[in-house]
């Protein structure tokens, strides 16, 4: 059994998350994850889910009763989601920590917007794009 | 020229984001995006970047001077990043809107943690993967 399971059970006790009423009104994440089979789509959704858990854990980081559990789970997320790649994890954390109300951050974000947009579609690179047209007869967008 | 370019230039004026000092102290997003070539890694990072822009746009949604620009850019993100898939966009927005300080949300999140973790690695569900291939016979970005 993965070590995170025991620690997640500990968190369940701490948050009273084992109570039957917790399942009322559907799931937060599980139904959404079931909608997406394609790896890149799953990463879009999981990225938001992981950042949610990181924020949640940050809010409880000083609580000694669950500190070990939180650390174990974060470590397992690091292994499973970031493939133990510290640079990937660090870049991700940088992105999640930018303050949307900081005027310098706002200006930088708007300054970079055109280049960010140009890279958003999977077929952003010209060579790749031509190839994808051949295979798909896809939308004549443009 | 993509219509978003003109609207992004309009936003630059509004935020004074064309000033030379904006480039000081490195980039927010561009250097990070340059680090990641693999599609699934890019999606992890772009997911955070897109949610940042959505939050930024939300904060300025009532400003008439940039409303058209913001809506054009959001539409283009919808086309490029979500492949005009409303369900993908809706699921993404649900995830970004969960409040990490709401105790009911916290309990649900902890309740779902074990199952979320089990699905985090790309090869989490071999059986499911095989089955999803049956329905696809293609590389489709669903």
């Amino acid at each position: 059994q993965d070590p995170y399971v025991k620690e997640a059970e500990n968190l369940k006790k701490y948050f009273n998350a084992g109570d039957p009423d917790v399942a009322d009104n559907g799931t937060l994440f599980l139904d959404i994850l079931r909608n997406w089979k394609e790896e890149s789509d799953r990463k879009i959704m999981q990225s938001q889910i992981v950042s949610f858990y990181f924020k949640l854990f940050k809010n409880f980081k000083d609580d000694q009763r669950i500190q070990k559990s939180v650390e174990t789970i974060k470590e397992d997320i690091n292994v499973k989601f970031f493939n133990s790649n510290k640079k990937k994890r660090d870049d991700f954390e940088k992105l999640t920590n930018y303050s949307v109300t900081d005027s310098n951050v706002q200006r930088k974000a708007v300054h970079e917007l055109i280049q960010v947009m140009a890279e958003l579609s999977p077929a952003a690179k010209i060579g790749k794009r031509k190839r994808s047209q051949m295979f798909r007869g896809r939308r004549a967008s443009q | 020229q993509d219509p978003y370019v003109k609207e992004a230039e309009n936003l630059k004026k509004y935020f004074n984001a064309g000033d030379p000092d904006v480039a000081d102290n490195g980039t927010l997003f561009l250097d990070i995006l340059r680090n990641w070539k693999e599609e699934s890694d890019r999606k992890i990072m772009q997911s955070q970047i897109v949610s940042f822009y959505f939050k930024l746009f939300k904060n300025f949604k009532d400003d008439q001077r940039i409303q058209k620009s913001v809506e054009t850019i959001k539409e283009d993100i919808n086309v490029k990043f979500f492949n005009s898939n409303k369900k993908k966009r809706d699921d993404f927005e649900k995830l970004t809107n969960y409040s990490v300080t709401d105790s009911n949300v916290q309990r649900k999140a902890v309740h779902e943690l074990i199952q979320v973790m089990a699905e985090l690695s790309p090869a989490a569900k071999i059986g499911k993967r095989k089955r999803s291939q049956m329905f696809r016979g293609r590389r489709a970005s669903q």
């Epitope: 079931r34 909608n35 997406w36 089979k37 394609e38 789509d41 798909r136 007869g137 896809r138 939308r139 004549a140 967008s141 443009q142 | 993509d2 219509p3 978003y4 949604k61 058209k68 913001v70 809506e71 054009t72 959001k74 539409e75 283009d76 919808n78 086309v79 492949n83 005009s84 898939n85 409303k86 369900k87 993908k88 966009r89 809706d90 927005e93 999803s132 329905f135 696809r136 016979g137 293609r138 489709a140 970005s141 669903q142």
Partner: antibody, heavy 124, light 111 residues
Amino acid sequence: EVQLVESGGGLVKPGGSLRLSCAASGFPFSRYSMHWVRQAPGKGLEWVSSMTSRTNHKYYADSLKGRFLISRDNDRDSLYLEMNSLGVEDTAIYFCARGYDTSGSDSGVDFQYWGQGTLVTVSS
Amino acid sequence: NFMLTQPHSVSESPGKTITISCTRGRGYIASYYVQWYQQRPGGVPKIVVFEDTQRPSGVPDRISGSIDTSTNSASLTISGLQTEDEADYYCQSYDDANHVIFGGGTKLTVL
């Protein structure tokens, strides 16, 4: 009240052209994507083309082989479909339908509103 | 081709329940919204279910939509059948190139 009114249909010879129009009212046209759908006599619904509201992304059914062109004029609250090299298989009622707000501001529902349709007959 | 396959026709007596299936041939049913339309003879298509399960205002709660990922299909269920339910019903979804796809339609006859 949302209204979509198609016009421009009629009888045309094979190889000919037609331009269909769809006049929209009762909603902020410039915020919504729009669609054309057709229905041949006694047959099912067939999607023809779609266009986003602000970014001019255009989508076409593969079967059209580049013969049709969708466009819109947000100042006139109108959607158009330019149809060239028409064949008898293009004979159908052509419906205009409202899409959703692809910026997500006030999303709406795809295909919630349809016009009454305009009949295009291709015959020699 | 991203076909959506529907039965050609279904029939049932008033008061009974019918289910019309819509099976996706390629792609994953849950990854795109499914809509259902009712079209009476000579009429314009009218949306009766949107976004998989949602009902527009004015559509009776006898009509419901669902998704079944195990069969990669969507279903439209009409309970307490009435004569005015007699019509053609079409499912509709999307493919990965943002093309709209319609099912072939199902003719519902109320006996």
